[in-house]
């Protein structure tokens, strides 16, 4: 018989989690003994099992361990792991700290969506990233010409939405544009949103006649000539 | 005509509840996150909270997080307040303001429209 | 938090002259989109803040074109080529890019 004893002290020493809320956490604390010991957990000094939080946890017996997602301020608080068997009992303290973030308008991630060059009847995708605390929103939208005008009596241009999206933080959203006409030629917007406000970056899609054969293959030649 | 209509201001005591209203017309109010912006007496403004259009993502200054609580009800175009703990420092004219739509908006992205805001009083 | 810092506290303003008012953010509103995220409100007495200036230079409609906001990331300006009786009141500058959002400490202009 043994009392428990942790299998990866080296796994533990880092004591103090300071985390931007929203994040996920994890606190491990991977034993052993004989016999096989159990593990509980406690929230400043309380036994702890997650039921007055939102979310939830998880707790993974086999990992020695316990999970608490989108963190919150008041999910601050000394969190132990507390080991034992008949033989004897381990504990260990974790600090939390969940770091308050100021809300701020999507950020979108710079050169995306980027200005595309296709061929008639081929497919584009165009990326936009976006970086935002509160849960984001999209949309794609397509600058149209209205009367051989881009925009109205007020300024403002003419656009067709051609999605809107709900995504989870730091998701890449993709425009599929399936087999391109010269008609999809335009500029692009990815619009995003929040609680806070709207951001918006544009790209420009260039739509080429369809290729022709006698001319890609007389192309090369063409290059060493004066 | 979008309007924002406040209600629900009064005089109560430092320590009581106070629950304010604010009633949206003249456009899609399920599309705009709302916010709160108050104003004491003789002094500048103050933003107190914001609610995403669906009330998922709700966001409160330092001075009221823990004791106001923004929510809002689409189904009746209203947004609200509630107050507790109130302290005579919260004495101000409270404003209900259209925040930032779900899509594409021509002009500015929110904090064109303001109520003619309700007044709360916290005095013993 | 983002501090905005007015100047000056008070302006008064022969009509017909032009009036002009600072406010510093005490950290860049220039976002990623390449937008300028600074608004000027002009509250009258008894009235809520109306919108004047969006996005640090473009009118709200119906502003009248005396008004104009110009600056950069952190130093903002708000211009009024022609006072008129009708603009007296308090002008504040917004930052519109994070909460909490926050307003400078107001500008009242008065007529001479």
């Known amino acids: 018989q043994q009392a428990p004893y942790w299998t990866h002290p080296q796994r533990m020493e880092k004591k103090l989690h300071a985390v931007p809320a929203g994040n996920t956490v994890k606190f491990r604390c991977p034993a052993a003994g004989n016999p096989t010991p159990t593990i509980r957990w406690l929230k400043d000094g309380q036994a702890f099992h997650g039921e007055n939080r939102i979310g939830g946890i998880r707790l993974r017996h086999q990992h020695w361990s316990l999970v608490m997602e989108s963190v919150v301020p008041s999910d601050r608080g000394t969190y132990t792991c507390l080991v034992e068997n008949a033989v004897g009992s381990i504990r260990y303290n974790y600090l939390l700290d969940v770091l308050e973030r100021s809300p701020h308008r999507p950020i979108l991630q710079a050169g995306l969506p980027a200005n595309t060059t296709a061929v008639v009847g081929s497919d584009v995708e165009l990326l936009c990233k976006v970086y935002s605390d509160a849960q984001p929103h999209i949309q794609w939208l397509k600058h149209i010409v209205i009367n051989g005008s881009s925009f109205g009596a007020d300024g403002f241009p003419y656009v067709q939405v051609l999605k809107t999206a709900d995504i989870n933080s730091s998701e890449v959203e993709v425009l599929y544009l399936r087999n391109v006409s010269a008609e999809d030629a335009g500029e692009y917007t990815c619009l995003a949103g929040n609680s806070i406000g709207l951001s918006y970056q544009s790209a420009w899609l260039t739509v080429l006649p369809e290729e022709d054969p006698t001319w890609t293959a007389a192309a090369p030649e063409a290059r060493y000539t004066d | 005509e979008v309007q924002l209509l406040e209600s629900g201001g009064g005089v109560v005591q430092p320590g009581r509840s106070l629950r304010l209203s604010c009633a949206a017309s003249?456009?899609?109010?399920?599309?705009?996150?709302m916010h709160w912006v108050r104003q004491a007496p003789g002094k500048g403004l103050e933003w107190v909270a914001v609610?995403?259009?669906?009330?998922?993502?709700?966001y409160y200054a330092d001075s009221v997080k823990g004791r106001f609580t923004i929510s809002r009800d689409n189904s009746k175009n209203t947004l609200s307040l509630q107050m507790n703990s109130l302290r005579v420092e919260d004495t101000a004219i409270y404003y209900c303001?259209?925040?930032?739509?779900?899509?594409?908006?021509?002009?500015?992205?929110?904090?064109?429209?303001w109520g003619q805001g309700t007044m709360v009083t916290v005095s013993s | 938090d983002i501090v905005m810092t007015q100047t000056p506290l008070s302006l008064s303003v022969t009509p017909g002259q032009p009036a002009s008012i600072s406010c510093r953010s005490s950290r860049s509103l220039l976002h990623s989109d390449g937008k300028t995220y600074v608004y000027w409100y002009l509250q009258k007495p008894g009235q809520p803040p109306q919108l004047l200036i969006y996005?640090?230079?473009n009118r709200f409609s119906g502003v009248p074109d005396r008004f104009s906001g110009s600056g950069s990331g952190t130093d903002f300006t708000l211009k009024i080529s022609r006072v008129e009786a009708e603009d007296v009141g308090v002008y504040y500058c917004m930052q519109y890019i994070e909460a909490p959002l926050t307003f400078g400490g107001g500008t009242k202009v008065e007529i001479k």
């Open positions: 609610i995403s259009y669906d009330g998922s993502n709700k």
């Open positions: 996005e640090l230079s």
């Open positions: 303001v259209r925040g930032a739509g779900r899509g594409y908006t021509y002009g500015p992205d929110g904090f064109d429209i």
């Open positions: 003249g456009f899609t109010f399920s599309s705009y996150a």
